[in-house]
């Protein structure tokens, strides 16, 4: 008898993060035998979708011609061929930006900053949050993940960096999440510069442990004072 | 494209009370504050308040507290403001307006009640 | 609650002339948090919608032309168009977002001479 039938292989285009009300196309690709295909979401009935195949009959085409919040979420294919169903493809992470307001982000002291010092980027979201995702500009993967410990909502998050390098330098963008779905993101921040200046021998970038992100002080503009202070987002690095 | 669509002209009757709706589309409606500002005629911006359409929560102006209140329809995407107990005074041009980061980003066209025996 | 004040209440300019219009607070708009000023700015044509033209007092909103350019810090802030053109002709707000309630100032009406 032979083994299972070979894994099929899941993709969106244009990319798995989708803003609001923008096109996507899902393709399943497995092989020349399938007479079926089906797409499944997590946490929603089986299949999600069927489709049959386009020729040569190796893939099939799930269309989203407007993404919204329903759409976001974990899928997996699958195609049938006469000995029955393949083994379910690796997992998609299909990410809907634009599900809340952009939050601000900023650096502290300055986005001006001398190797070897220390900055803070302070991502601040218009309503409590307790995910924070930072991002740098052709990064392959978010640079940092902070995740509130308890599911204490928070109305920023604080991102140290210490001791800084020429590696810092570029451009940074933050998402804020609610942790009922990590699938749908906020609007991303306006990009924020962060400049290197400085001559020193820059040693190896290390990010520092210090996960403050208690709101402010009083003054903190619109911003509540009653949340626990330094209930904690817990850092994971990506 | 967001468009914030409001509901047309009200002439009502001093004492009465009044609702006009904002219908939002083209964004993710749940996940943005909506606010209301009133114009009187010749006259500059007061802030009425707001609500987040994902959980119904609301604040106000403790000038509107009692005159204004804020309600959602999140099955039509659509925020309400009833006012109530209407004087002359109530006579304005009263916009809805999403809220980016406290400060608004899109304004409805306007709904203007005059207030009138 | 904050009291924001604009001046001039109106200014008459011709086309092509820089324009520099002031927004003054009761107290600072400026953040110790993120070092950011809590302000932004409309733009009002007769009969329409205010619109946003800048908001942490001197960011420009998404396809508002580079002649406007906000600036200023804590309690004074200033709105300057460096070529008016015809289709500017209108009121500006001033707007504060730094405590509840937002407040507006009483605006600055731009005319042609």
């Known amino acids: 008898q032979a083994g299972p039938l070979p894994k099929p292989t899941l993709w969106a285009e244009p990319g798995s993060v989708i803003s609001w009300g923008n096109s996507v196309t899902i393709w399943c690709q497995g092989t020349l035998e399938a007479r079926e295909y089906r797409l499944d979401k997590e946490e929603s009935p089986a299949p999600w979708d069927r489709q049959n195949p386009l020729e040569p009959k190796n893939k099939a085409r799930f269309s989203i011609p407007s993404m919204t919040e329903d759409y976001a979420g974990r899928y997996r294919c699958y195609y049938r061929s006469p000995v029955g169903w393949s083994q379910p493809s690796d997992p998609l992470e299909l990410v809907m930006t634009g599900a809340y307001s952009k939050p601000t982000l900023s650096a502290l002291p300055s986005p001006l900053v001398t190797s070897g010092k220390s900055v803070t980027l302070l991502c601040q979201s218009r309503s409590p949050m307790d995910t924070f995702l930072l991002i740098k500009e052709r990064a392959a993967h978010p640079l940092l993940h902070l995740r509130s410990e308890h599911g204490a909502q928070q109305h920023q998050a604080e991102f140290p960096m210490s001791p800084v390098t020429s590696v810092h330098g570029g451009t940074y963008r933050c998402f804020s999440s609610h942790g009922f779905s990590h699938y749908l993101l906020s609007h991303p921040s306006d990009p924020l510069e962060l400049i290197v200046s400085g001559s020193l021998e820059d040693p190896r970038p290390s990010p520092t442990r210090s996960v403050s992100t208690a709101a402010g002080p009083e003054d903190q503009p619109l911003m509540p004072t009653g949340s626990v202070p330094h209930s904690g987002l817990r850092r994971h690095w990506e | 494209e967001v468009q914030l669509q409001q509901s047309g002209p009200e002439l009502v009757k001093p004492g009465a009370s009044v609702k006009i709706s904002c219908k939002a589309s083209g964004y993710s409606f749940t996940g943005f504050y909506i606010d209301w500002v009133k114009q009187s005629p010749g006259k500059s911006l007061e802030w009425i308040g707001y609500i987040f359409p994902s959980n119904g929560e609301t604040s106000y102006n403790q000038k509107f507290k009692g005159k204004a209140t804020l309600t959602v329809d999140k099955s039509s995407s659509t925020v309400n403001m009833q006012l109530n107990s209407l004087t002359s005074e109530d006579s304005a041009v009263y916009y809805c307006a999403r809220q980016a980061f406290y400060y608004f980003d899109y304004w409805g066209q306007g709904t203007t009640l005059t207030v009138s025996s | 609650d904050i009291v924001m004040s604009q001046s001039p209440s109106s200014l008459a300019v011709s086309v092509g002339e820089k324009v520099t219009m002031s927004c003054k607070s009761s107290?600072?708009?400026?953040?110790?948090?993120?070092?950011?000023?809590?302000l932004a700015w409309y733009q009002q044509k007769p009969g329409q919608s205010p619109k946003l033209l800048i908001y942490w007092a001197s960011t420009r909103e998404s396809g508002v032309p580079d002649r406007f350019a906000g600036s200023g810090s804590g309690t004074d802030f200033t709105l300057t168009i460096s070529s008016v053109k015809a289709e500017d002709l209108a009121v500006y707000y001033c707007?504060?977002?730094?405590?509840?309630?937002?407040?507006f100032g009483a605006g600055t009406k731009l005319e042609l001479k």
């Open positions: 707007q504060q977002y730094y405590s509840y309630p937002l407040t």
């Open positions: 107290q600072s708009l400026l953040s110790s948090s993120n070092q950011k000023n809590y």
